[in-house]
Interface confidence: medium
C-alpha cells in the first residue's frame, strides 16, 4: 500500500500568450497520494467547474479557455490539496494578444471651410497598435494643420477645400494591420456671388437678360426675386461648371422692377445665402410715333378683338422685336389695370387704349399710323374717366405711380390732331359715338382743367348730353 504523499506541482504554470478567439491552456502537473483536489483561480477568484467557457480535464490538471476574450487576461493559479500537508499553488499569467481592431471607425464628415474637423479612429490591440492615415492613395503627412491624436483620431484645423477627399485610418501592430472603410471628408463653402446682375434701362416690350454667377460647395441654387416676390414670368437658364452656377433670367419687360439674385446652399440644417440686386427701369413709352417704323396688318390678338373694327388694318411698331406680341402684352397689362375702374370709365378707356395702341393704319409706301382724334381722347379723360384720371395724375405728382403712368399706354390728348382741322388725319372712337344713343345725362364733373380745353365733338358725329361745363352739342 502506497504511503500518503503531500501534493507537489511538478510543472509550474508559465505565462501563456493567446490570440483572441483562440484556445489557451494552462497545465498544472501534480504528484501526490491520494489524488489531490485541484482548483483554479483567475485574479484570486475561483473559476467554477460548470463555467462553460472553460474546460478542466486530467483530474483538474489541464485548464483550457475555449475561446479567449480580451477580458481573459490576468493571473491564473492552480491550487492542489489532498489533506496531506498543506495545499500547494502555482501561478502563471495569460497575456491576451490581439490583432489590431478599429472599435470606432471614422465616418463621413461635412465641414464648412475654415472650421476644425476631427475624424475618429479608436483602436484595440495588443501590443497597442500604431495609427496612421491614408488620403486617397497616399499616406497622409502631418503638418501644422493636420495631426494624428493620441487616440488615433485625425484632427484638421482650418479646413481648406483641398482637404476634401477620401480618408481611411490604418491600425498596425506585430500581429497584423486593420484598415477602416474609406470615408469622405466634404468641405462645404458658403455661397458667394461672383458676378452680380447689371441694371438696365430699356424700352417697354424689350427683352432683357439678367445674369448672376455664384460659387459654393455644395453648388448653390439661384432664385430670382422681383420686387420682393418670386419672379412670376420670364425664363431661367442655368448651367453649372466647376462648382460655379450661372443663372440667366430672360425677361420681357412690361414694368420696372428690382430684381434680386439669391444664391443659397445648405450646410446640414442651416443655409447660407448671398444676394445681389439690379434694377430694370423703363424708358418713357409715349414717344412720338411719327418716326416709328412699322407695318400695317390685321389684328390677330384677343384683348382688343371686340373693340377694333373687324377688318381694319392696324399699325405694328417694329421698334419691338416682336411687335404683335409686345403690343398685345402691353394692352393685356393695361387691361388688368382697368379692372378697378368704374363701369362708366372702363369701356371708354378700353376703346381709347386699344385704338391708341393698335392705331388704324394706312398702308401706302410708308405705313402710317393714324392717331386718335383729340376730341375723343379728351372726352375719355375729362368725362368718362375724369375721377380715375385725376387720381392717376395725383399719384404721379406725388411720385407714387411714376411707373404706372408710363405703363398704361395713355395718349397725351393735347398732342393729338384735332378732327376739326382734318377729319381724315385721325381716328374716331365708335364706342363714344354709340354712347350718345344711350346716355342722356352724365354726373356733374369737377374738372382739373377749364372747359375750354375740350373742343366740342361735332354734332354730326356725336351729341353728348352732359353737365353744362361739358356741353358738346
Amino acid at each position: 500500500e502506497k504511503l500518503p504523499k503531500a501534493p507537489v506541482i511538478t510543472t509550474p504554470l508559465e505565462t501563456v500568450d493567446a490570440l483572441v478567439e483562440e484556445v489557451a491552456t494552462f497545465m498544472c502537473a501534480v504528484e501526490s497520494y491520494p489524488q489531490p483536489e485541484i482548483s483554479w483561480t483567475r485574479n484570486k477568484i475561483l473559476i467554477k467547474l460548470f463555467d462553460t467557457r472553460y474546460s478542466i480535464r486530467e483530474n483538474g490538471q489541464l485548464l483550457t479557455i475555449l475561446s479567449v476574450e480580451d477580458s481573459d487576461d490576468g493571473i491564473y493559479c492552480c491550487i492542489a490539496n489532498n489533506g496531506v500537508g498543506g495545499a500547494v499553488e502555482s501561478c502563471g499569467a495569460l497575456q491576451v494578444k490581439m490583432k489590431p481592431k478599429i472599435t470606432r471607425p471614422p465616418i463621413n464628415v461635412k465641414i464648412i471651410e475654415g472650421l476644425k474637423a476631427v475624424l475618429p479612429c479608436t483602436t484595440m490591440g495588443n501590443p497597442k497598435p500604431s495609427v496612421s492615415w491614408i488620403k486617397g492613395d497616399n499616406a497622409l503627412r502631418e503638418n501644422s494643420r493636420i495631426a494624428v491624436l493620441e487616440s488615433g483620431s485625425l484632427r484638421i484645423h482650418n479646413v481648406q477645400k483641398e482637404d476634401a477627399g477620401q480618408y481611411r485610418c490604418v491600425a498596425k501592430n506585430s500581429l497584423g494591420t486593420a484598415y477602416s472603410k474609406l470615408v469622405k471628408l466634404e468641405v462645404e463653402v458658403f455661397a458667394r456671388i461672383l458676378r452680380a446682375p447689371e441694371s438696365h434701362n430699356v424700352t417697354f416690350g424689350s427683352f432683357v437678360t439678367l445674369r448672376c454667377t455664384a460659387i459654393g460647395i455644395p453648388v448653390p441654387t439661384i432664385s430670382w426675386i422681383e420686387n420682393g416676390n418670386a419672379v412670376s414670368s420670364g425664363s431661367i437658364q442655368e448651367s453649372v461648371k466647376d462648382r460655379v452656377i450661372d443663372s440667366r433670367l430672360q425677361l420681357f419687360i412690361t414694368k420696372p422692377g428690382l430684381y434680386t439674385c439669391i444664391a443659397t446652399n445648405k450646410h446640414g440644417e442651416k443655409f447660407s445665402t448671398a444676394k445681389a440686386a439690379a434694377t430694370v427701369s423703363i424708358a418713357e413709352w409715349s414717344k412720338s410715333q411719327k418716326d416709328s417704323q412699322g407695318y400695317c396688318a390685321q389684328y390677330r390678338g384677343e384683348v382688343c378683338d371686340a373693340v377694333l373694327a373687324k377688318d381694319a388694318l392696324v399699325f405694328f411698331n417694329t421698334s419691338y422685336r416682336d411687335p404683335e406680341d409686345a403690343q398685345e402684352l402691353l394692352i393685356h397689362t393695361a387691361w388688368n389695370e382697368l379692372k378697378a375702374v368704374s363701369p362708366l370709365c372702363r369701356p371708354a378707356a378700353e376703346a381709347l387704349l386699344c385704338n391708341h395702341l393698335f392705331q388704324e393704319c394706312s398702308p401706302g409706301v410708308v405705313p402710317t399710323p393714324m392717331p386718335i382724334c383729340r376730341e375723343y381722347c379728351l372726352a375719355v379723360k375729362e368725362l368718362f374717366c375724369a375721377k380715375e384720371w385725376q387720381a392717376m395724375e395725383g399719384k404721379a405728382h406725388r411720385g407714387l405711380y411714376r411707373s404706372g403712368m408710363h405703363l398704361l399706354p395713355v395718349p397725351e390728348c393735347s398732342k393729338l390732331p384735332s378732327m376739326h382741322r382734318d377729319p381724315t388725319a385721325c381716328t374716331r372712337l365708335p364706342y363714344l359715338d354709340y354712347k350718345k344713343e344711350n346716355i342722356t345725362t352724365f354726373p356733374s364733373i369737377t374738372s382739373s382743367r377749364p372747359s375750354a380745353d375740350i373742343p366740342n365733338l361735332p354734332a354730326s358725329t356725336s351729341s353728348f348730353a352732359v353737365s353744362p361745363a361739358y356741353s358738346m352739342t
Epitope: S233, G234, S235, F252, Y295, C296, A297, Q298, R300, G301, E302, D305, K310, D311, L313, D322, E324, D325, E328, L329, H332
Partner: antibody, heavy 121, light 112 residues
Framework: EVQLLESGGGLVQPGGSLRLSCAAS????????MSWVRQAPGKGLEWVSA????????YYKESVKGRFTISRDNSKNTLYLQMNSLRAEDTAVYYC??????????????WGQGTLVTVSS | QTVVTQEPSFSVSPGGTVTLTCGLS?????????PDWYQQTPGQAPRTLIY???SRHSGVPDRFSGSILGNKAALTITGAQADDESDYYC????????????FGGGTKLTVL
C-alpha cells in the same frame, strides 16, 4: 430645348370621346399661344384649334366647333383637346404645336411628334 | 370658306432654284394673312421654315426665303439640295367672319 409630347390618342368608336394632352417643356408655357393641328393618313395638314397664352379665347375649325374643346393648364404646362361626338373623318395624327408668341394665331414654331386618333367601328 | 391653293408637285434640279406659291381661292394673299411655310418629310412632324411672310425661323438655312409675289405668298429655295425633297405647306391667317388658320394642300417637291 422645346419639347411637346402628345398623349391620349387611340381607337374609338364613332360618337365616342377622347381627351388629348400635350405636355410642354423647355420654354415658359404660359407665355405662348398653342394649337392643335391634324393630318389624316396620306393627306395634308389641317388646323383644328387655337388658344392664346392666357386661355381667355378659343378658336376652332368650323367642322369641329361644338364637338371639340381646347384648354390649357398653365400651372401644369399642359395643353388639352377634348374631342366628343367623334366621326370617321376625325381620324388623323393630332399634333400639338407652339405658337411663336402670346396670341392664338402666331406662326407655329415648334411641333410635337403627334398622337394617332382612329375613329372606327 | 377660305381655300388655300398650292401647286400639288414641283421638281427642281440639285443646285437649282425653285419658287413655290400659296394663293387664296378668293382674293389676294397680303402680309395681313401672315403667310407661314412648313416643311414635312414622310413620317416626321412638320418643321417651321418661314413665318409672317419673310421671317426665317431659327436654324433654317438662308437658302430658304419668303415673300409676296403679286397676289400670292412665295417660298423660294435657292441652291436646292437632295434633302430639300419634302412636302411644303403654307399656312395663312384669315378673317372671314371669325379668326381662322388655313393650310394649303401642300406641294410635293422632288429634287431630281
Amino acid at each position: 430645348e422645346v419639347q411637346l409630347l402628345e398623349s391620349g390618342g387611340g381607337l374609338v368608336q364613332p360618337g365616342g370621346s377622347l381627351r388629348l394632352s400635350c405636355a410642354a417643356s423647355g420654354f415658359t408655357f404660359s407665355d405662348y399661344g398653342m394649337s392643335w393641328v391634324r393630318q389624316a393618313p396620306g393627306k395634308g395638314l389641317e388646323w383644328v384649334s387655337a388658344i392664346p397664352w392666357q386661355g381667355g379665347s378659343t378658336y376652332y375649325k368650323e367642322s369641329v366647333k361644338g364637338r371639340f374643346t381646347i384648354s390649357r393648364d398653365n400651372s401644369k404646362n399642359t395643353l388639352y383637346l377634348q374631342m366628343n361626338s367623334l366621326r370617321a373623318e376625325d381620324t388623323a395624327v393630332y399634333y400639338c404645336a407652339k405658337r411663336s408668341g402670346r396670341i392664338a394665331f402666331g406662326a407655329l414654331d415648334a411641333w410635337g411628334q403627334g398622337t394617332l386618333v382612329t375613329v372606327s367601328s | 370658306q377660305t381655300v388655300v391653293t398650292q401647286e400639288p408637285s414641283f421638281s427642281v434640279s440639285p443646285g437649282g432654284t425653285v419658287t413655290l406659291t400659296c394663293g387664296l381661292s378668293s382674293g389676294s394673299v397680303t402680309s395681313s394673312n401672315y403667310p407661314d411655310w412648313y416643311q414635312q418629310t414622310p413620317g416626321q412632324a412638320p418643321r417651321t421654315l418661314i413665318y409672317s411672310t419673310d421671317s426665317r425661323h431659327s436654324g433654317v438655312p438662308d437658302r430658304f426665303s419668303g415673300s409676296i409675289l403679286g397676289n400670292k405668298a412665295a417660298l423660294t429655295i435657292t441652291g436646292a439640295q437632295a434633302d430639300d425633297e419634302s412636302d411644303y405647306y403654307c399656312g395663312l391667317y384669315s378673317y372671314s367672319g371669325s379668326k381662322n388658320y388655313v393650310f394649303g394642300g401642300g406641294t410635293k417637291l422632288t429634287v431630281l
